[in-house]
């Protein structure tokens, strides 16, 4: 009679995470008596999946019924699988032994390999926010996908990125794997709207992307553009004064007058009104009453947008015997001043 | 060559249930998905949802939940599309089309399309 | 769900003419635009992936152009074989979806 074999019919076998693999042994013929063992990974260090004999294996059920006399299927289901599991796994015969059962012979082996889906990307953007013309670094992350194979991109208002850097870890072999992609994006006055993408593709997913965003409006600064104007003489003595807060990003707006270097009054934006673009325009006035001044009146609009540091916006009122015809002061600069007589 | 082969026209009444299949060759069946697109006389296509060939999930349009569902017979590389208590409006032409994934999630290949019809 | 409108059902072209198909998504759809050509009684063929990537076996008269939400498909000189209904589709998000058709009929 021939000697027996140890038939493993799958070199490898592709398994989805959360699946049930099926290892497939059998068995040429019934002699010798003994049970049959399943290990994972070869040499002294291998590790017991299975012992037909003993144990409890709770993930681990058999494909024939191996209580039966004639029963040359050693075939077994692992359940609920996950990237750990990956490897070869050996379907081992012993022969009956006093006091314990020796090695006979093994099968040449299966390789499981899990395929696991990546988990959902997360894309952080920088701790502090950045003004228009600024390139800011986003970083997006996915873990636990197998195999390594995976496709990365980085969108931005409708544009596939091309300025980024992707790595995957680890390099050599692994049970599951890591993504990690830094995106440089260029900031615009437009982009309170807008969102940056990451999109992970893996043969998991087939027939949808992973994606994950951040929105720039968490991002970007957009600092205000101040202009004062003076309007019309309102009564005999009272001169109207406004500062235009224009094109800002976000809300937090604190804005202070001051008449010669003196505070006259301090004010938080609240009902602004909002443009196309995300960004805010918001109005002070400031009315003076130019008879309480012996002398020249310089007005100052101060304006702390989000902590930073403040800008501000200057106009002079000439307290003058002299009439001349009333303007505005649409200076461009942070500073400017615009000479102006009342009476 | 890759080639989606579904089987043939079917006639049904109203209330019946209806299977249609899907046959892929050529490629790994496994690796793509499989999406499936209906066509009413005369009108436009109609995306129904799409099935993953190696988890087995399935995703359905918001029109195509309820009497409809996706099955697979992975070993022999088909699938297949049933409809559950056929109405009339359910006379159409049916596609299954092959999936990409990695930047091209188009549907590249398809079937010839499996014509149902109901009527009482 | 992104609506993809295509603005012409149908078009009557002169064999040897220019003919363009436009395709606008109510959403952006980063480039993720396919076109489909369908003659009577057959299934789909895909043109163009990606709204400028012509499919392999395509006659290099048909190009795609386009990006954020519109889109367009060009056919540089009519052909009888061109008579057909094309589809623009979207696969940037699910549920896919597909545009109205536009059918080209000959004058």
């Known amino acids: 009679e021939e000697e027996l074999q140890v038939i493993q019919p799958d070199k490898s076998v592709l398994v989805a995470a959360g699946e049930t693999a099926t290892l497939r042994c059998t068995a040429t013929s019934l002699i010798p008596v003994g049970p049959i063992q399943w290990f994972r990974g070869a040499g002294p260090g291998r590790e017991l999946i299975y012992n037909q004999k003993e144990g409890h294996f709770p993930r681990v059920t058999t494909v024939s019924d191996l209580t039966k006399r004639n029963n040359m299927d050693f075939s077994i289901r692992i359940g609920n699988i996950t990237p750990a599991d990956a490897g070869t796994y050996y379907c081992v015969k012993f022969r009956k032994g006093s006091p314990d059962d020796v090695e006979f012979k093994s099968g040449a082996g299966t390789e499981l390999s899990v395929r696991a889906k990546p988990s959902a990307p997360v894309v952080s953007g920088p701790a502090a926010r950045a003004t228009p013309q600024h390139t800011v670094s986003f970083t997006c992350e996915s873990h636990g996908f197998s195999p390594r194979d995976i496709t990365l991109k980085w969108f931005k208002n409708g544009n596939e990125l091309s300025d980024f850097q992707t790595n995957v870890d680890p390099v050599g072999e692994s049970v599951s794997y890591s993504i990690h992609s830094t995106a440089k994006v260029v900031l615009t006055r437009e982009d309170v709207h807008s969102q940056v993408i990451c999109e992970v593709a893996h043969v998991t997913l087939q027939g949808d992307p992973l994606r994950g965003t951040a929105n720039l409006s968490e991002t970007i600064r957009v600092p205000p553009t101040l202009e004062v104007t003076q309007q019309p003489v309102r009564a005999e003595n009272q001169v109207n004064v406004t500062c235009q807060v224009r094109k800002f990003y976000p809300q937090r707006l604190q804005l202070t007058w001051l008449e010669n270097g003196n505070v006259s009054r301090t004010e938080t934006a609240s009902t602004v009104t909002e443009n196309k673009d995300g960004t805010y325009n918001w109005m002070s006035w400031l009315l003076v009453n130019v008879s309480a001044h012996r002398d020249d009146v310089k007005l100052t609009c101060q304006v702390e947008h989000d902590g930073q540091p403040a800008v501000s916006k200057s106009h002079d009122l000439k307290v003058s015997a002299h009439p001349k015809e009333q303007g505005s002061n649409t200076a461009a600069e942070n500073t400017g001043s615009n000479e102006r007589n009342i009476y | 060559q890759i080639q989606l082969v579904q089987s043939g026209p079917e006639l049904k009444k109203p209330g019946e249930t209806v299977k249609i299949s899907c046959k892929a060759s050529?490629?790994?069946?496994?690796?793509?998905?499989m999406h499936w697109v209906k066509q009413a006389p005369g009108k436009g296509l109609k995306w129904m949802g799409w099935?993953?060939?190696?988890?087995?999930?399935?995703t359905y349009a918001e029109d195509f939940k309820g009497r409809f569902a996706f099955f697979l017979e992975t070993s022999a590389s088909t699938a297949y599309l049933q409809i559950n208590n056929v109405k009339n409006e359910d006379t159409a032409t049916y596609f299954c089309?092959?999936?990409?994934?990695?930047?091209?999630?188009?549907?590249?290949?398809w079937g010839q399309g499996t014509s149902v019809i109901v009527s009482s | 769900d992104i609506q993809m409108t295509q603005s012409s059902s149908s078009f009557s072209v002169s064999l040897g003419d220019r003919v363009t198909i436009t395709c606008k998504a109510s959403?952006?759809?980063?480039?993720?635009l396919a076109w489909y050509q369908q003659k009577p009684g057959n299934a789909p063929r895909l043109l163009i992936s990606?709204?400028?990537s012509l499919e392999t076996g395509v006659p290099s008269r048909f190009s795609g152009s386009g990006s954020g939400k519109d889109y367009t498909l060009s056919i540089t000189s009519l052909q009888t074989e061109d008579v057909a209904t094309y589809y623009c589709?979207?696969?940037?998000?699910?549920?896919?979806?597909f545009g109205g058709g536009t059918k080209l009929e000959i004058k």
């Open positions: 050529g490629y790994t069946f496994t690796d793509y998905a």
């Open positions: 959403e952006d759809i980063y480039n993720r």
């Open positions: 089309a092959r999936g990409g994934y990695g930047s091209n999630y188009v549907m590249d290949y």
């Open positions: 589709q979207q696969y940037w998000n699910s549920p896919r979806t």
């Open positions: 099935k993953n060939t190696e988890t087995g999930e399935s």
């Open positions: 990606g709204a400028t």
